[in-house]
């Protein structure tokens, strides 16, 4: 038995931040689980991890330097990524493992979400026009 995951096919991070919602075919209420977001076609980089526990607040962390937060719904986990760089444009995959109560369940690999990070266009300010040509 596998959990199915739905993700938006593409998201654009205009302000270097994005909300990626992972929607599961499984109710996470009163379960202990580990939800994670992975970067790259091979899912080699674990961007963010959310530990859910029936008795505690969500534990959210990144061991790979991403600025992330997480929010839990009954059948979803939303990852909020901030301070993204243009070169972090990539495909991102949601993963879920439900540990307790047994049995252990994980997900079928999703189609992923392409996150396109748009660079900030820094226009010269009229108050500080920069050096003028002679």
């Amino acid at each position: 038995n596998k959990i199915l995951v739905k993700q938006s096919p593409m998201l654009v991070a205009y302000d270097n931040a994005v909300n990626l919602s992972c929607k599961y075919s499984y109710n996470l209420f009163s379960r202990e689980f580990r939800a994670s977001l992975h970067k790259g076609l091979d899912s080699a980089v674990e961007v963010c991890v959310v530990y859910g526990n029936y008795s505690q607040q969500l534990q959210v962390y990144s061991k790979t330097g991403f600025n992330c937060d997480g929010k839990l719904g009954n059948e979803s986990v939303t990852f909020y990524l901030q301070n993204l760089y243009v070169n972090q444009t990539d495909i991102y995959f949601c993963k879920i493992e439900v540990m307790y109560p047994p049995p252990y369940l994980d997900n079928e690999k999703s189609n992923g979400t392409i996150i396109h990070v748009k660079g900030k266009h820094l226009c010269p300010s009229p108050l500080f026009p920069g050096p003028s040509k002679p």
Epitope: Y54, Y100, P101, P102, P103
Partner: antibody, heavy 120, light 111 residues
């Protein structure tokens, strides 16, 4: 035949660290369906769960030990490891690794155990 | 944490006796009709051995004189006719929630 063999026990100084190994045979640590836990038993006392690792590599730890413990594995050697830091006398115990299946998480195979004594 | 309390802590019995050990959980360990409560036997200097899983299922290779029953918070391990090799310590364990916990043990001694 499923087998688990622990090693690495012995005498350790208080404040020191231990790294125990659990060599698995008869099944793969990275194949779905089974996981492995570390469990300890102080002399003359009951059983205490330390933590578990799943085929995916995800880990779960006892809250009382979480800050001092790391469970890891080497898939190429099909071996599990337990690292426990800042050791104290009350960590003296026989340390077991035990396999569980994903349906009920009952420990169906156990290693023989390895004794760790924390003393100066 | 889910506390498991076994009773009695120890008992003396003779070969052929019927022995009953109880395990009470501080909260239900049932989920969708399955009780995540297991029983182990441990002999001195040896690792524990799984006897019963999911409250009442007999582990492969375990003699049929061992049986388990119960649901929710109250569970029982029964040895229908005690044999010499059954003198040991028995533990219950729950796998419903982390941290996984064990009962304190029941030592079965020769009368």
């Amino acid at each position: 035949e499923v087998q688990l063999v622990e090693s690495g026990g012995g005498l350790v100084q208080p404040g020191g660290s231990l790294r125990l190994s659990c060599a698995a045979s008869g099944f793969s640590l990275s194949t779905g369906g089974v996981g492995v836990s570390w469990i300890r038993q102080a002399p003359g006392k009951g059983l205490e769960w330390i933590g578990s690792i799943y085929h995916s590599g995800s880990t779960y730890y006892s809250p009382s030990l979480k800050s001092r413990v790391t469970i890891s594995r080497d898939n190429s050697k099909n071996t599990l490891y337990l690292q426990l830091n800042s050791l104290r006398a009350e960590d003296t115990a026989v340390y077991y690794c035990a396999r569980y299946e994903y349906d009920y998480y009952a420990f169906d195979y156990w290693g023989q155990g390895t004794l760790v004594t924390v003393s100066s | 944490d889910i506390q498991l309390t076994q009773s009695p802590s120890s008992l003396s019995a003779s070969v052929g006796d019927r022995v009953t050990i109880t395990c009470r959980a501080s909260q239900s360990v049932d989920f969708y009709g399955i009780s995540f409560l297991h029983w182990y036997q441990q002999k001195p200097g040896k690792a524990p051995k799984l006897l019963i899983y999911a409250a009442s299922s007999l582990e492969s290779g375990v003699p049929s004189r061992f049986s388990g029953s119960g649901s929710g918070t109250d569970f029982t391990l029964t040895i229908s006719s005690l044999q010499p090799e059954d003198f040991a310590t028995y533990y219950c364990q729950q796998s419903y929630r982390t941290p996984l916990t064990f009962g304190q043990g029941t030592k079965v001694e020769i009368k």
